[in-house]
């Protein structure tokens, strides 16, 4: 079973501590070098007006996952209670595409880095999603921030079009999925 | 839904191998770490090791270092341990598990017994 | 290697008690531990992945807590079916480690 929302919400950039956009064909492209080169164009929708949704009110869908950026500045477990708050999980990225269709949505926030769902114990530990499943650097690489002073970036966050590990406790933004089956 | 499925009981002499297989269903394969469990008769759970099945990398418990060998078959969906050197008190239930958040052990297979006894 | 210990190694209770079990690394792990639940003859069972995360369909009697070196599980209300042994597990360095267990019986 499908659940359908219903939405009438305005499309603002920032409404109730979320970041909206109605569609993102519009987006300034990223400065640094970019990951969306390879990737074909988003099919993204957010569901604003009176229509049937899977997702609710102010998440963005993209093929078979709603999705949330949030604007409220937490560390990256925070994030990841917020997220499982509203019955999601932080984001996985699971294909290019999809990796193409995020880069397009945080290139709008230049200046805003968000967590994803990404973390590991320690360095000598591998990288793992929060569901459980392995990391593949086949996606997509992990930019370390790491230096003497801050050995152990373990959680990591994507900006603009790059990906880096960070302190975990660092507060930031957050990227909140939510699968859907049709 | 979730299963993991492992061979049967097996009996062994000391010095021998045994290798213990453990067949997936209902997710990707090789998306998930599969972790290897002992527990020996009355005692504790010991972690043996892991398998990336995705790209067949290991990680085995120092303690069994030189005698433990971890595989998988893909196009099977089925992890194998193998151990060899076989000693008397290897004697175990021997678990594989799923690696689930936070690098938890989230489905398990029912366990293989193997002995080992002259 | 990082050193679990649990006490009780064993406890007596009823059903309907609350009861507490503490788990204590070596060293700090952070977050990164479970608890699982193991009748006699089966395998073990998830019941709670970092430190306080309840399992899903793992009922809500079941809760964890703690952060560093000291964490706890609590059943709020014991029923029939908790008896059982209880291990904690950490997951912060190789090799992952479990703790000795800690046996719930019936009083």
């Known amino acids: 079973t499908m659940a359908i929302w219903r939405s009438n919400s305005g499309s603002n950039t920032l409404e109730n501590g979320y970041f909206l956009s109605r569609n993102k064909e519009n987006h300034s492209q990223p400065t640094q070098s970019s990951l969306e080169d390879s990737v074909t164009p988003t099919k993204a929708v957010k569901t604003t007006g009176v229509l049937s949704s899977p997702c609710p009110p102010n998440w963005i869908i993209y093929e078979k996952s709603c999705y949330l950026f949030s604007m409220s500045l937490n560390s990256w477990d925070g994030s990841k209670r917020q997220c499982w708050q509203l019955g999601s999980n932080l984001l996985k990225i699971d294909s290019s595409n999809e990796l193409g269709f995020i880069v397009k949505q945080v290139s709008s926030q230049p200046d805003n880095s968000f967590w994803i769902g990404l973390s590991r114990p320690q360095t000598e530990v591998p990288w793992l999603w929060e569901d459980g499943s392995t990391f593949s650097s086949n996606l997509f690489q992990i930019r370390t921030t790491a230096t003497q002073e801050n050995p152990s970036p373990n959680c990591v966050w994507i900006h603009v079009s790059v990906i880096y590990d960070q302190l975990c406790s660092v507060p930031s933004y957050s990227i909140c999925e939510k699968k859907f089956s049709m | 839904q979730v299963q993991l499925v492992q061979s049967g009981a097996e009996v062994k002499k000391p010095g021998a191998s045994v290798k213990v297989s453990c067949k997936s269903s209902?997710?990707?394969?090789?998306?998930?770490?599969i972790h290897w469990v002992r527990q020996a008769p009355g005692q504790g759970l010991e972690w043996m090791g892991w398998?990336?099945?995705?790209?067949?990398?290991?990680n085995y418990a120092q303690k069994f270092q030189g005698r433990i060998t971890m595989t998988r078959d893909t196009s099977i969906s089925t992890a194998y341990l193998e151990l060899s050197r076989l000693r008397s008190d290897d004697t175990a239930v021997f678990y594989c598990?799923?690696?689930?958040?936070?690098?938890?052990?989230?489905?398990w297979g029912q366990g293989t017994l193997v002995t080992v006894s002259s | 290697d990082i050193q679990m210990t649990q006490s009780p190694s064993s406890v007596s209770a009823s059903v309907g008690d609350r009861v507490t079990i503490t788990c204590r690394a070596s060293?700090?792990?952070?977050?990164?531990l479970a608890w699982y639940q193991q009748k006699p003859g089966k395998a073990p069972k998830l019941l709670i992945y970092?430190?306080?995360s309840l399992q899903s369909g793992v009922p809500s009697r079941f809760s964890g807590s703690g952060s560093g070196t000291d964490f706890t599980l609590t059943i709020s209300s014991l029923q029939p079916e908790d008896f059982a042994t209880y291990y904690c597990?950490?997951?912060?360095?190789?090799?992952?480690?479990f703790g000795p267990g800690t046996k719930v019986d019936i009083e």
């Open positions: 060293q700090g792990i952070s977050s990164w």
């Open positions: 970092g430190a306080s």
């Open positions: 598990a799923r690696n689930s958040g936070s690098y938890s052990f989230g489905y």
């Open positions: 209902g997710y990707t394969f090789t998306d998930y770490y």
């Open positions: 597990q950490q997951a912060y360095s190789f090799p992952f480690t």
């Open positions: 398998i990336n099945p995705n790209s067949g990398d290991t």
